[in-house]
């Protein structure tokens, strides 16, 4: 069957987000991938979206991320814009209303996005073959 257009959009967004690192991609998030063996695919997408939502809700107005100049402010707005897009598309793919995120493990946002990209690319390769 054909790959969902939403999946393609997620991969495209992740490709952009992982092109470059920035100050706030080095901040930590809950690592839902550390022990996700008994988790369905839809739950994984839902939990990933939850983690991203927690991150941008918490850091959208974080002065460490906003920086001191218009240029730094633009960069942070760019990060938040892409994370919101990713969150929205992951919810669409998950099709679930809510899901718990209870893990204690942490990873940087940067590593979280890289891991999510790997998972999404694997899914894409299966549905496109």
């Amino acid at each position: 069957h054909k790959c969902d257009i939403t999946l393609q959009e997620i991969i495209k967004t992740l490709n952009s987000l992982t092109e470059q690192k920035t100050l706030c991609t080095e901040l930590t998030v809950t690592d839902i991938f550390a022990a996700s063996k008994n988790t369905t695919e839809k739950e994984t997408f839902c939990r990933a979206a939850t983690v991203l939502r927690q991150f941008y809700s918490h850091h959208e107005k974080d002065t460490r991320c906003l920086g001191a100049t218009a240029q730094q402010f633009h960069r942070h707005k760019q990060l938040i814009r892409f994370l919101k897009r990713l969150d929205r598309n992951l919810w669409g793919l998950a099709g679930l209303n809510s899901c718990p995120v209870k893990e204690a493990n942490q990873s940087t946002l940067e590593n979280f996005l890289e891991r999510l990209k790997t998972i999404m690319r694997e899914k894409y390769s299966k549905c496109s073959s």
Partner: antibody, heavy 118, light 107 residues
Framework: EVQLVESGGGLVQPGGSLRLSCAAS????????MHWVRQAPGKGLEWVVW????????TYADDFKGRFTFSLDNSKNTAYLQMNSLRAEDTAVYYC???????????WGQGTLVTVSS | EIVLTQSPATLSLSPGERATLSCKAS??????AAWYQQKPGQAPRLLIY???HRYTGIPARFSGSGSGTDFTLTISSLEPEDFAVYYC?????????FGQGTKVEIK
Amino acid sequence: EVQLVESGGGLVQPGGSLRLSCAASGYTFTDYSMHWVRQAPGKGLEWVVWINTETGEPTYADDFKGRFTFSLDNSKNTAYLQMNSLRAEDTAVYYCARGGIFYGMDYWGQGTLVTVSS
Amino acid sequence: EIVLTQSPATLSLSPGERATLSCKASQSVINDAAWYQQKPGQAPRLLIYYTSHRYTGIPARFSGSGSGTDFTLTISSLEPEDFAVYYCQQDYTSPWTFGQGTKVEIK
């Protein structure tokens, strides 16, 4: 594949005007900022302007405020640099460059030569 | 406007040697410094952004370091294709500015 193609350069007399175009392809145009950078013959790089492609808001280097206007046509994925009151010292290769998602300029066009001479 | 001063203007080295290029800013740009390589007749190419992060596809022999006002680009072992002009650039604040360039030439 990301591509930026400039056009519109050429010979113009002092005091004249020219409009440069930069056609972008291979990515979502409004996701990345766009810049113009110029390089006079045998000289270094000089940043001219950047534009937030989402809002259309440009930010100019002081030397170019008033004379140069950066605009977009998002439907054509194209950026324009309108240059008025051109002087001999504006003679340069003009590059458009895509702003990296956060930093720097990650893709550049091949450049278009503008020569201001009588 | 933040002025970037690069040194030396020209660096004459042989393939295999280590190249160290310096860039000094007139005021702090924190870590918002980038490096570009430009060869004759070509557009510049982004090598390093955010002081020390190699851009996609850039070989590991290129590295960046520094913070505040002093930045360094190091090429650990020069390859024939590395002989070019290198520019530092700050994107801490507008106007973005470039250094005047350092030419790395074959000795």
